[in-house]
Structure formats: C-alpha cells, structure tokens
C-alpha cells in the first residue's frame, strides 16, 4: 500500500474578478501551497513477509519514495537503529553491502528499494511480532526511518498489512536547504492569504486518482509532534532478539554520519545490476516525517547526514580531510 500526497487541482479564478496583478498574487499562493503540501515529504515503506516454504524465514523489503539520492540504508530489528534496535544490514550504493546474522542476503532491488532475507533457527530466529526498521539517508531530504512488523496471526506467504500507527523518528537533517526555502514560502503564503482573506478564494478540486490510491495523509507539524509524543515504540518480545553467533551485533553502530569518506574522484555510478522489481502494492509501511525532534522534545541519536552531505560532486573530501577529520 502506498500513500501519496494528493495535490489539489488548481481551478483558475473566474475571469473579471481581478486585474492582472491581483491574478498573479492569487495564483502564487496556490502554487506555494502545492509546494508546501508536496515537497519535502518523502516516505519510506516497509514490507515484512514470512516465506511459506520456510516458516523461520522472513523477507524485509523497504523503499524510499523521494526524489533525493540515497547515500545509505540501515535495516535493524527490535526497534529503530540507535534506539535499542540491532543492525541487520547496511547498504551503500557504491561502497557495498554488509549484513549481520541472522540476515542472509541483503541487496538492492531498485535504486530506491532494498530487500533483506532473514533466516534463523533457535535463538537467532526472528519471530512474527518482531519490528523491522529501515532508515534511508538521502540528499537533500536527510534521514528517514520507518518500521513494520508481521502480526503473529499472519499466514505464511502473506505480506504484513499496514502498520496501525506510525513510529515517528527522523533526524533534523535535510530541513536546512530545501525546507528552509519552503518554510519561507509557506510563511509568505500565509501572509498573502491574510491579505486576501476578504476576496473569494478559488475552488479546490481533489485530483483524480486511481481506485487503488488511498487518500492522502497530510501530516501537519502539530499532528506529527502529537503522534511522536503519544506513539511509543513497539514492545519487542525479548526472546526474539538476536543471539550472539559469530558476530557480536553492532547495536546502534558508530555515529558515522559526519565522516563517511566517498573516495570518489568523480561521481560514481550505482551498482551495475539494478533489478527492476516494482514497488509492492501491499505491505506494511510507515511514513516518517523529517525534523520532528524539536516538537517531540526528543534528541536525535546521530547528527543528521543532511548537515554534512556534500553538494560538491567530488564528495566530502573536497571540503574535509581524510575520514572527515573534526
């Protein structure tokens, strides 16, 4: 199941109501409104599936619905990465893929989606109520994370239904650039709307969507902060936590955000063999809004990558020394 922001269809104002100047100032707010509604709100979907053939085998698929370029994907279980979750896999488009038991195979499915096969027996086996989280670091959006789980009652071979409540968690990254412009635009929009409140506003028509497309979820900051304050992380059955095998699992992992070297002398190409798996039509997904720590009174576990991702095509080394010396 995908959720997409439904952009209101613009209905031109009736002719003769305003002069040229008035027309321009009236159209501008709606253009800005469209930008405010749609821009800067990428989403992450998570699909958890139990394989019918092997009951202890899970497939986790995650995708990023945004326009930015993905710099890193972290898959964890037992809660979000850095908040008690245990890292299962880390995927970088150019620098490679690393996974930890019981993850068996992590791979890119498309340039914006990944899949991870988990298998286990005994203590390291995932169980049905385990929460799996995917964190996408992208430029310029910043860091976005979503979580999903398979309900205990799910039949093998079936995908998880949508997760009932969003687990809100995002880094402050990515809101400085594009979002700053949008914020200014939104403030300007409000100013214009107040100036024109005595004038009749153009009518809004919902855009036509396909029958499958669900209705838009418009997360206003106030709603987001409320949810962030009221939706706790899912409780995890501790018996399903990973056991130490050959690997001592990297809880949290290094706070690498600010110092990832790219080594790139030129803009590297992504993995050569991108599969063409479509985004799933159904599955468990949660969208995460960016930059909610301030409202939720929560401190981000890492410095967000958006603060140190580099527009320079030569990568961070163009601005920093080796290893991002601080």
């Amino acid at each position: 199941m995908r959720t997409e922001a439904q952009v209101p269809a613009l209905q031109p104002p009736e002719p003769g109501l305003e002069g040229a100047m008035g027309h321009r100032t009236l159209v501008l707010p709606w253009v800005l409104l469209t930008l405010c509604v749609t821009a800067g709100t990428p989403e992450v979907w998570v699909q958890v599936r139990m394989e019918a053939t092997e009951l202890s085998s899970f497939t986790i698929r995650c995708g990023f619905l945004g326009s930015g370029s993905i710099s890193l994907v972290t898959v964890s279980w037992g809660g979000p990465n850095g908040a008690g979750g245990t890292t299962l896999a880390v995927l970088h488009p150019e620098r490679g893929i690393r996974q930890w038991a019981p993850a068996r195979q992590a791979r890119w499915e498309t340039q914006s989606s990944i899949s991870l096969i988990l298998e286990g027996s005994g203590a390291s086996s995932p169980c049905a109520n385990t929460t799996f989280c995917c964190k996408f670091a992208s430029f310029p959006e910043g860091s976005w994370e979503a979580c999903g789980s398979l309900p205990p009652s799910s039949d093998p071979g079936l995908s998880a239904p949508p997760t009932p409540a969003p687990i809100l968690r995002a880094d402050l990254a990515g809101i400085l650039g594009v979002s700053g412009v949008l914020l200014f635009g939104c403030v300007y929009l409000l100013h214009l709307l107040r100036r024109h409140k005595h004038r009749p506003a153009p009518r809004l028509q919902p855009s036509r969507t396909s029958p499958q497309a669900p209705r838009a979820r418009a997360w206003a900051p106030s709603q987001a902060s409320q949810a962030a304050l009221h939706v706790p992380y899912a409780t995890i059955n501790t018996s399903c936590r990973p056991a130490t095998l050959d690997t001592a699992h990297p809880h949290g992992g290094p706070s690498w955000w600010a110092s990832l070297p790219t080594h790139a002398a030129h803009r590297p190409q992504g993995p050569a063999a991108w599969a063409s798996t479509p985004i799933p039509a159904r599955g468990s997904f949660v969208s995460v809004e960016n930059g909610l720590y301030a409202q939720a009174g929560e401190r981000p576990p890492h410095t967000g990558p958006g603060l140190t991702l580099f527009p320079d095509p030569r990568g961070p080394r163009a601005m920093e020394g080796p290893l991002g010396v601080r």
């Epitope: 490679g96 690997t247 110092s259």
Partner: antibody
Framework: EAQLQQSGPELVKPGASVKISCKAS????????MNWVKQSHGKSLDWIGD????????TYNQKFKGKATLTVDKSSSTAYMELRSLTSEDSAVYYC????????????WGQGTSVIVSS | DIQMTQSPASLSASVGETVTITCQTS??????LAWYQQKQGKSPQLLVY???TLAEGVPSRFSGSRSGAQFSLKINSLQPEDFGSYYC?????????FGAGTKLELK
Amino acid sequence: EAQLQQSGPELVKPGASVKISCKASGYTFTDYYMNWVKQSHGKSLDWIGDINPDNGGSTYNQKFKGKATLTVDKSSSTAYMELRSLTSEDSAVYYCSASGPPYVLLDYWGQGTSVIVSS
Amino acid sequence: DIQMTQSPASLSASVGETVTITCQTSENIYSYLAWYQQKQGKSPQLLVYNTQTLAEGVPSRFSGSRSGAQFSLKINSLQPEDFGSYYCQHHYGVPLTFGAGTKLELK
C-alpha cells in the same frame, strides 16, 4: 590526517600468545570499524575479522575463530588483536585497517606488524 | 565464502605499456568489487571500488570494468610508480575475501 600506528615486530615462541596494537589518530575512532588482515610472506591478503569500536562487537572470519581475539580501548583510540597458540603458520605481517560504512572497504591501513613464530 | 580468482599471477611490462588484470568471482557480487595496490614493503591502498570508481587521488590511467562475473583493472601508459602487487576484493558482505594477487614487474 588519518593515521593508524601499529606496534613493533614480534618474535615469539610456538605455543605462546602475542598481542599487537593499532593506535588511531586524525579521526573519530568510533566512526570506523577496525579490521585486521594477515599477509603471509609473499602471499595474498586474508581478512581476520573486524570490530566496532563503539560497542566492542566483533565479527570473525571462521578461519580465524579461536586464533584471534579483537578488542578496543576507546579511551586511547587503540585496537588490539591477540593471537594465541602460535605456530609457524601464524608467521606473517598483520595489518590493521579502518573501514567506513558499510564496513566492507578497507579505507586506511596501518604500516603492518611482523610476527615471527620461531623456537 | 565468495571465491576470487585473479589472473595472471605475475606480469612483466614496460613503462608506457597498457596492462589488464582480471578477477573472477564465484558468486554474484553485483558491481561490488574493489582493487588494492601494494608497493614493495608498504601497506595496501584502496585504488578502485564499485568496479570502476577511482579512490581519491588515483590517476585516471587506472580504470575498472565488468563483464558478468569477470572484473578487470586496466592500467594505461604504465608509470614507474605503478609497479607492485594488485589485489581484488569483493565488498558484498563478509567475510571479505581477496584474489591471490598479481605481481606487476618492470620488464
């Protein structure tokens, strides 16, 4: 500039143990996994394992389980590898190497520590 | 574990020549193959990763390519500083494994 400074050469007797060190400087120690790689004389490279300095979690190549133990001291930004029950097969140059996410590329290398096992 | 079969084991060439080293993998590693250069008595250094991305400071005479499970490192117009050993390594999961190496010697 990032640097990995390894301890000096070791001459040890068969059956003994040895602990070699790798001191990191010029970067935040906990941001990179520390890998250890073995290079026998005139031969290829063998990955021993790595350690996450942030929490001490380690991963070993099955081939070196029971032979090598990886540890870190965050306060001194130093990684250690202990090799036990040494035989002549363990005579080699051992390198430490720092790797950034996703911890599968060996970005920076120490100068190597020569270990010679001889009676 | 992923096996890396590197060839040739040794290679003699002159300054100005072009040489190619290959590496075959036992499993699909997508484009996640790296090359390291090791000069006599020194530590290895990352040269190329993700098949063809040059590490920082690596001259453009080095280039990487892939054909199926076979990966190649090509060095155009060999320079005196290019002589030494070259190793391939997959960067698709652990354990990390390396090719046996290619020793590039001055003819």
